[in-house]
Amino acid sequence: LTCLGGFASPGPVPPSTALRELIEELVNITQNQKAPLCNGSMVWSINLTAGMYCAALESLINVSGCSAIEKTQRMLSGFCPHKVSAGQFSSLHVRDTKIEVAQFVKDLLLHLKKLFREGQFN
């Protein structure tokens, strides 16, 4: 599920339905944000590289009682091959940097958009 693939081909390859739905959920969160997301909760920043889905989940799973990101948490678990629980950290976390959930979601969305544009925009 985490393989984006296809970027060497002549045309772009659209995402799987699951990844498309994740992107759409991130868009919904960023566009419909009125009050501070998750009451301004802070999460560990991550390196947006290979394994980023698990790293993102490991970071976001530490936010509890925030219905706005529950769907995103569920979706990310579908992209992560191992079970993730609160307090778990991988080497992909930038452990000295915490950012607001809203910024984390925005960064993740921007990165996914960049990945899909890489194969088509010169």
Partner: antibody, heavy 119, light 107 residues
């Protein structure tokens, strides 16, 4: 509300160039790609190309590669489409439209700019 | 390049009748197919995205179906304002392409 406002109609001579502008408002300009579509009189829709305003990266329909140039100015939230070496069959209405990512639909369109190429 | 073939080119119907428009892709495009309506002198307007997803503000009489290579736009009961040209669009791969259009005219 989201709006894409294009420059006015233009008349050009064969061999000349035209530059059409598309000013976006009501949303964050760099969050969406801007695509350009044209429609010759009485004909269907033809995709010309797209630009990612955030990076300036472009993608072109092979038919227009080398003759069309797409640019975007983040400071004014304006996209531009320049078409060079105009021919009579370039007479068309040119539309700008926004797309979140290329596989998304074109949810908002400019009003269109009629470019007439005539000697 | 993905070629989209729309049929029929023209559909002559009366208000209240059901309209069924077809769009066939030259290769599998999953559900990456969008439908637009265009009236004379106006820009196209998005009706349906991802083959069957409805747009807020678009009347419920418009519906889409299909996946892979065969797609259908259905207008359950034509209203006077529905007489227009309808285009399907490939969102699967570059170059983005449109069908030739189906004109729905008053019989």
């Amino acid at each position: 509300q989201v709006q894409l406002v294009q420059s006015g109609a233009d008349v050009k001579k064969p061999g000349a160039s035209v530059k059409v502008s598309c000013k976006a408002s009501g949303y964050t300009f760099i969050d969406y790609e801007i695509h350009w579509v044209r429609q010759a009189p009485g004909q269907g829709l033809e995709w010309m190309g797209a630009i990612d305003p955030e990076t300036g990266g472009t993608a072109y329909n092979q038919k227009f590669k080398g003759r069309a140039t797409l640019t975007a100015d983040k400071s004014t939230s304006t996209a531009y489409m320049e078409l060079r070496s105009l021919r009579s069959d370039d007479t068309a209405v040119y539309y700008c439209t926004r797309i979140l990512l290329y596989y998304y639909p074109m949810d908002y369109w400019g009003q269109g700019t009629l470019v007439t190429v005539s000697s | 390049e993905i070629v989209l073939t729309q049929s029929p080119a023209t559909l002559s119907l009366s208000p209240g009748e059901r309209a069924t428009l077809s769009c066939r892709a030259s290769q599998n495009i999953s559900d990456y197919l969008h439908w637009y309506q265009q009236k004379p002198g106006q820009a196209p307007r998005l009706l349906i995205y991802y083959a069957s997803q409805s747009i807020s503000g678009i009347p419920a009489r418009f519906s889409g179906s299909g996946s892979g290579t065969d797609f259908t736009l259905t207008i359950s009961s034509l209203e006077p304002e529905d007489f227009a040209v309808y285009y399907c669009q490939n969102g699967h791969s570059f170059p983005l392409t449109f069908g030739g259009g189906t004109k729905v005219e008053i019989k």
